[in-house]
């Protein structure tokens, strides 16, 4: 039902859902800190623009008695329970930040009259695509899928002269929330990825994966998986790998590859790592940067959600427009705003755009090097290292089907 919003007369409130079931196991007070840092910045920006208004956040915690798995499995009802709590307290803000689980976001979107914007740090699944009042500030599965199709089709680069049309996907059900939905999208028979590939098989058992590595009768040389290097090592160990195998390791929210003094372990030589660019600067084929402590993408998305709200609030107030309208609810898309680490671009459907980076292990230096970058906004690949020192024959990626191209 419709809830009155605390969103007028110069006072604007943000409702922040602090759910026990979350896409990432981030300490909740840390997310509060991120929100409060964002509020400080927003207040400063509004003040600089001559807008004398109050912006606050209300943190809505669930009791955690029923929905206490800690991950996203029991999140479907938790989101609705929190909305009910907001409704009963008549404490809805101008915007809802949270939930991060695909299940809860989908259900909340389905079961409520969304006349207010919802900003999510997560909600990676395809079921949260194309939602009119939902904004997602972490790369959703659709973006990954478009990169993979683009890369598979590419055949005009010095290091990739074959189009690919096949793939194995390793998915064993123990994945983190982001990986679960990324792989789910690749597995779905109706997805863009499946539609564009001629052959795709999901490997669900460790042994299936391990057998493929040296199977002469394999149907594809390419295996997609999601997780970090340690996850791959647990699975692959020091097993021998056929020389034309290419493992694509999707590890978007991990910037350890960009640390100084990081050496790629030997088991990564057959692997291309897909991760997000660590900053807005153009990446060279080698890099170093000051890393922010720990993986902070989730907290950063919360903070950027606050900055996005501040950006929209500023625009609407400067134009003398009402905040509690469908126009405001639908406005959080097709724009660029000043995020914490630089400009953040949202596409026509309110999903964050980013620069994805494909890394390889140099056989010379044992360092991770940038092979290419991909701009999700324009769906375009930009080669970076034109003569990579690959492990693969002739320093070129093999064909995806054994028996054709370099073996």
């Amino acid at each position: 039902s419709q809830v009155s919003q605390n969103c007028h007369n110069g006072s604007y409130e943000i409702s922040v859902l602090m759910m026990g079931n979350s896409a990432f196991a981030e300490p909740l007070k840390n997310l509060e800190d991120a929100v409060n840092e964002g509020l400080e910045i927003v207040r400063g920006r509004l003040q600089n623009a001559g807008l004398n208004v109050t912006v606050n956040a209300t943190f809505m915690y669930s009791d955690g008695l029923i929905h206490n798995s800690g991950d996203c499995r029991s999140s479907t009802c938790e989101g609705l329970d929190l909305l009910r709590k907001i409704s009963n307290a008549q404490r809805m803000g101008c915007v809802l930040i949270g939930p991060s689980c695909t299940y809860s976001t989908f259900q909340m979107y389905l079961d409520t009259e969304l006349s207010y914007p919802m900003i999510s740090a997560g909600s990676f699944g395809l079921s949260c695509d194309y939602k009119e009042t939902l904004t997602r500030l972490m790369s959703p599965a659709r973006k990954l899928m478009y990169f993979l199709v683009n890369f598979w089709k590419t055949n005009d680069l010095p290091f990739k002269t074959y189009s690919w049309s096949t793939s194995y996907v390793y998915k064993n059900g123990t994945e983190t929330e982001d990986c679960f939905w990324y792989l789910n999208a690749l597995e779905a028979s109706v997805s863009y990825f499946s539609h564009e590939l001629g052959f795709k098989v999901v490997l669900r058992q460790d042994k299936e994966f391990q057998d493929i590595l040296m199977d002469h009768n394999r149907k594809s040389n390419v295996i997609i998986m999601c997780g970090g290097p340690e996850f791959l090592y647990k699975l692959k160990g020091d097993r021998a790998v056929a020389e034309d195998i290419v493992i694509i390791l999707v590890d978007l929210f991990n910037d350890q590859y960009f640390e100084d003094n990081v050496t790629a372990p030997d088991y990564m030589k057959n692997v291309l790592v897909l991760t997000l660019s660590p900053g807005n600067s153009l990446l060279n084929s080698s890099f170093s940067r000051n890393l922010s402590p720990t993986k902070r993408d989730f907290a950063l998305a919360y903070l950027n959600g606050i900055l996005l709200f501040g950006h929209m609030l500023k625009i609407f107030l400067e134009n003398g427009e009402n905040i509690t309208t469908p126009k405001f609810a639908h406005a959080f898309r097709n724009l660029t705003f000043e995020g914490y680490d630089g400009p953040v671009t949202l596409d026509d459907w309110g999903d964050v755009d980013s620069t994805m980076v494909l890394l390889y292990t140099s056989v010379d230096t044992k360092k991770y090097k940038v092979l290419l970058t991909y701009d999700t906004h324009v769906n375009k690949t930009y080669p970076v290292d034109m003569s990579p020192t690959f492990t693969w024959k002739n320093s070129k990626l093999p064909n995806d089907i054994t028996g054709r191209g370099p073996q």
Partner: antibody, heavy 120, light 108 residues
Framework: EVQLQQSGPELVRPGASVKISCTAS????????MSWVKQSHGKSPEWIGD????????SDNQKFKGKATLTVDKSSSTAYMEYRSLTSEDSAVYYC?????????????WGTGTTVTVSS | EILLTQSPTTMAASPGEKITITCSAS???????LHWYQEKPGFSPKLLIY???NLASGVPARFSGSGSGTSYSLTIGSMEAEDVATYYC?????????FGAGTKLELK
């Protein structure tokens, strides 16, 4: 009252290991990151690393990689740091500290400190 | 690694005197990531100022902080005997988190 109570002083032989504990009270340990800091006598503090008590994920200072192992026991609200292959250079006061800011960027509560003396 | 250089290393001040301690970073950092601590002999360090200018809970208003980029400062508006301590700046912008070498403040 929010407190971080650390285990008592340790006198250890070179080459040995030590495991320091830090028990949190007055707050829920999983709500914040926990960092560990080394302070040698007369020197400035050095950040060793931090741990997310929810999943045990750690971030560390390369200088202490392989030297310090951070763990958390959520049931007892206790964080631990195991420090290996001790030398005289490791004689110092070790603090646990509660991380604040966007992903543990400063420390608002410090532990009582544990003095470790390495001597043969 | 971001290096923080504090100055002066030691200083003595009379009660009522205004004190300024500076902290210079080897590369530019966001003001959200610079913090100050006070350490009295025999005690654990205590958070004084976070995010450049925010006073931590229970810290007297005579303490203030400012700065941006590579240059930051801590000011004590009017020195008191209880302010005798060593003061450290700390950055949270890059791994590893690092502290300045400290400024020892004594009573004249």
């Amino acid at each position: 009252e929010v407190q971080l109570q650390q285990s008592g002083p340790e006198l250890v032989r070179p080459g040995a290991s030590v495991k320091i504990s830090c028990t949190a009270s007055g707050y829920t340990i999983t709500d914040y990151y926990m960092s560990w800091v080394k302070q040698s006598h007369g020197k400035s503090p050095e950040w060793i690393g931090d741990i997310n008590p929810n999943n045990g994920g750690t971030s560390d200072n390369q200088k202490f990689k392989g030297k310090a192992t951070l763990t958390v026991d959520k049931s007892s609200s206790t964080a631990y740091m195991e420090y290996r292959s001790l030398t005289s250079e490791d004689s110092a006061v070790y603090y646990c500290a509660r991380g604040r800011g966007m992903v543990a960027r400063y420390f608002d509560i410090w532990g009582t400190g544990t003095t470790v003396t390495v001597s043969s | 690694e971001i290096l923080l250089t504090q100055s002066p290393t030691t200083m003595a001040a009379s009660p009522g005197e205004k004190i300024t301690i500076t902290c210079s970073a080897s590369s530019s950092i966001s003001s959200n990531f610079l913090h100050w601590y006070q350490e009295k002999p025999g005690f654990s360090p205590k958070l004084l100022i976070y995010r450049t200018s925010n006073l931590a809970s229970g810290v007297p208003a005579r303490f203030s902080g400012s700065g941006s980029g590579t240059s930051y400062s801590l000011t004590i508006g009017s020195m008191e005997a209880e302010d005798v301590a060593t003061y450290y700046c700390q950055q949270g912008s890059g791994l590893p988190l690092t502290f300045g070498a400290g400024t020892k403040l004594e009573l004249k």
